[in-house]
Amino acid sequence: EEELQVIQPDKSVLVAAGETATLRCTATSLIPVGPIQWFRGAGPGRELIYNQKEGHFPRVTTVSDLTKRNNMDFSIRIGNITPADAGTYYCVKFRKGSPDDVEFKSGAGTELSVRAKPSAPVVSGPAARATPQHTVSFTCESHGFSPRDITLKWFKNGNELSDFQTNVDPVGESVSYSIHSTAKVVLTREDVHSQVICEVAHVTLQGDPLRGTANLSETIRVPPTLEVTQQPVRAENQVNVTCQVRKFYPQRLQLTWLENGNVSRTETASTVTENKDGTYNWMSWLLVNVSAHRDDVKLTCQVEHDGQPAVSKSHDLKVSAHPKEQGSNTAAENTGSNERNIY
């Protein structure tokens, strides 16, 4: 009778993570009598995957009834495959011996490759906000995929970016891989509503790439422009001065009025109006009683935006054209929270 051969017909098997792998093995003879074992890897460090005779292997089931007389099918199924299961699996026939069974013949091996989906890309931007015309870096990370081949693209508002660097780790063979990419983006004043998108394409995703996004509203700071104007006289001896704070983002803003360098009033932006581009406008006004002044008044609108150093705009209020009336240096009526009398 011909000597027993162990046949592993599949050189390689490709399985998606989470699925079941079938590793086929048949023997050409029932002789010699003895059990089979499955190993991952070869040599002294090989890992026992299944032993027909003894042990508990909860993820492994046999395809056929190994206890059946005349059975020569030693195929197994391994459930809930993960990338860590990748490797070469050997079906090994043992000959019954005393006290221990003796290895008789091994199959040629079946290489199990695991296809694992990449994790959802996570995009993170800079720790601190930056202003338009500055270049900021965004990073994108995705992990746990196999095989190694993967494509990553960056987009800003649907337009593909070209200034980025990508690494896939590790460089050598591994059960699974990670990708890390850094893209450089130049900010513009219109980027409050902009999005940066990292798109990852992999064989496991069947043409439906994964996307991670970052909103530039978390990254950008648009500093305000200030304009101080003197309005026509509202009433005799009263001038209305306004400070227009335009096109700023984010909303966090504090405004201080100074009269000849002295703090007159401080307020926080509340009822702002939003522009189409996502930036905000705000206006503060001050009612000045000019008859109380002998000299010209320097009014300064000072704005501290998002914790940045203050910016200011001044306006010189001419009082010489307004003759001073007797008793006008007494306290005048304060006509509103945004009004201020000057003594």
Epitope: L30, I31, T61, S64, D65, T67, K68, R69, N70
Partner: antibody, heavy 124, light 105 residues
């Protein structure tokens, strides 16, 4: 001592169904394949069905194929034979058997113990 | 079905052999004793040559090529019974022989 106790036999009507249960004791039930064997009056032994030790694999004789279901509950140490669409030729004494650490369902060379049997009569 | 002789006979103290053939390739044989119709069979040999603990050593089994043999040495009157062989065919289905009646003269 190894004991196999069958129950569920008796008078059955043609076209009906029967359910035989075998309770094993005195051995590690989950480690052994089990078989059902019957003997019609005045006839020889006939294999009916068998089941592997873990219950994953079942085997049936030609005479009952498609009408029989063998199952086991290793927690309860029982094996059950369900036989549908009964015929007069199913009349027999049904024996529960245990395999002795080798083989599986259908491997009759491995039988090392027998139950006392339960008689089934199919008659109208 | 397996093939076995319909009957054999022997005098007390003699040795008797009962043969069985027709099992699947490389299959083994078991031997079952039934002393009367309707009484439960008793395994005397399983897996070609294994003997249950309560069976006397006068009973032995062997297999050569594809034929199984039950040997009873020093036959006794109490050994009178029908002996069935059992195995599996090439499809894995269980098969019995028709039975051999042993008569002790």
């Amino acid at each position: 001592a190894v004991t196999l106790d069958e129950s569920g036999g008796g008078l059955q009507t043609p076209g009906g169904a029967l359910s035989l249960v075998c309770k094993g004791s005195g051995f590690t039930f989950s480690s052994h394949a089990m078989n059902w064997v019957r003997q019609a009056p005045g006839k020889g032994l006939e294999w009916v069905a068998g089941i592997s030790s873990d219950g994953r694999f079942t085997y049936y004789g030609a005479a009952v194929q498609g009408r029989a279901t063998i199952s086991r509950d290793n927690g309860q140490s029982t094996v059950r034979l369900q036989l549908n669409n009964l015929r007069a030729e199913d009349t027999a004494t049904y024996y529960c058997t245990k395999n002795g650490g080798c083989g599986s369902g259908g491997d009759l060379d491995c039988i090392d113990a027998w139950g006392h049997g339960t008689e089934v009569i199919v008659s109208s | 079905a397996l093939t076995q002789p319909a009957s054999v006979s022997a005098n007390p103290g003699e040795t008797v052999e009962i043969t069985c053939s027709g099992g699947g390739s490389n299959n083994a044989y078991g031997w079952f004793q039934q002393k009367s119709p309707g009484s439960a069979p008793l395994t005397v040999i399983y897996d070609n040559g294994k003997r249950p603990s309560d069976i006397p050593s006068r009973f032995s089994g062997s297999k050569s090529d594809s034929t199984g043999t039950l040997t009873i040495t020093r036959v006794q009157a109490e050994d009178e019974a029908v002996y069935y062989c059992g195995s599996a065919d090439n499809s894995g289905a269980g098969v019995f022989g028709a039975g051999t009646t042993l008569t002790v003269l």
